[in-house]
C-alpha cells in the first residue's frame, strides 16, 4: 500500500518545507484516497466484467450510497460552506459501513482496501476539526449498519462483485465532488 500523506521520504528529506495548512492536508488526504480507489477499481475491473456490463445488468440499486444533491450546498450554484461541510462529513460516515464491506473483497489489493478505510477515518477527523456545527452531523446507527453488512454479505459472488463496483464508483464520485467543494472553502 502507498505511504499515507505526510509520511513519504520527500517530507523527511525536506525539514525546511512549510508545514501543510489544514486545507492542504485535507486536499492531499482526499487525493491519496482517490489513488487507492483507482487501484481497487483496477482489480475489480480486471477480475470481472462489471465495469462494462454493470449498467445494462443493474435493475435496482438499494444501497443508498451517499450522493451530492443541489440542496447539500456543495455545488457552485447555491454553494453553502457550512451545509456542504456537514454533508461531506455525514456522507463519509455513511460510507464507512461500505468500506468495511470492501475488506476481504480483494486478493492482491487487500492492503490497499485497508489503507482506503483507515485514511477515510483520518479524513473524517480532519474535517470534524474544521466543522463548527458538529451538532448537525448524524452518525449512522451501528445496529442498522450491522444488518446492512449481513445483507450485503448474503449476496452471491456475482452480486458481491457488482456491489463492490457500485461502492467504489460512488465513493470516487463523492470524494471528487467533496474535493471540488472544499477547494472553494
Amino acid at each position: 500500500a502507498p505511504v499515507p500523506p505526510g509520511e513519504d521520504s520527500k517530507d523527511v528529506a525536506a525539514p525546511h518545507r512549510q508545514p501543510l495548512t489544514s486545507s492542504e492536508r485535507i486536499d492531499k488526504q482526499i487525493r491519496y484516497i482517490l489513488d487507492g480507489i483507482s487501484a481497487l477499481r483496477k482489480e475489480t475491473c480486471n477480475k470481472s466484467n462489471m465495469c462494462e456490463s454493470s449498467k445494462e445488468a443493474l435493475a435496482e440499486n438499494n444501497l443508498n450510497l451517499p450522493k451530492m444533491a443541489e440542496k447539500d450546498g456543495c455545488f457552485q450554484s447555491g454553494f453553502n460552506e457550512e451545509t456542504c461541510l456537514v454533508k461531506i462529513i455525514t456522507g463519509l460516515l455513511e460510507f464507512e459501513v461500505y468500506l468495511e464491506y470492501l475488506q476481504n473483497r480483494f486478493e492482491s489489493s487487500e492492503e490497499q482496501a485497508r489503507a482506503v478505510q483507515m485514511s477515510t477515518k483520518v479524513l473524517i477527523q480532519f474535517l470534524q476539526k474544521k466543522a463548527k456545527n458538529l451538532d448537525a452531523i448524524t452518525t449512522p446507527d451501528p445496529t442498522t449498519n450491522a444488518s446492512l453488512l449481513t445483507k450485503l454479505q448474503a449476496q452471491n459472488q456475482w452480486l458481491q462483485d457488482m456491489t463492490t463496483h457500485l461502492i467504489l464508483r460512488s465513493f470516487k464520485e463523492f470524494l471528487q465532488s467533496s474535493l471540488r467543494a472544499l477547494r472553494q472553502m
Epitope: 443493474l58 435496482e60 438499494n62 444501497l63 445483507k151 456475482w158 452480486l159 457488482m162 456491489t163
Partner: nanobody
Amino acid sequence: QVQLVESGGGLVQAGDSLTLSCAASGRPFSSFAMGWFRQAPGKEREFVAAITWSRGTTHYADSVKGRFTISGDNAKNTVFLQMNSLKPEDTAVYYCAAADGWKVVSTASPAYDYWGQGTQVTVSS
C-alpha cells in the same frame, strides 16, 4: 435449502393470456429478489421480469413491458407472472429464480442463486 416450483405453462393461441406461478419453500420470500427468465430453443436464457418483496418494486424486459405483470403473495410465498397479448415469440421455457440479499437487483442470470425446473409456454399463431 430453497426450492422453487413453477406451474401454469401450456399451449395457447396468439393474443391469449396465461398466468405462471412460482411457489417457494425453505425460506420466507422477504429476503429475496424474485425473477422470471425464459429460454427459447437454441437461444440464451433471457430476463423477463423481477420483483423485490421488501420494496414492492418491479422491473421488466422491454420486450414484455405493458403485456406482462409480475406480482407476489407474501403470505403464500408465491410469485406470479401474468402474461397478456401473448405472441409466438414468447414461446419458451419459463424459469422462476430467487436472489439473496435484494440490495442490488439485476437482470443478469448469475445474480440469482436458486432456480426452478421451468415450465413450457407455447404460443401458436
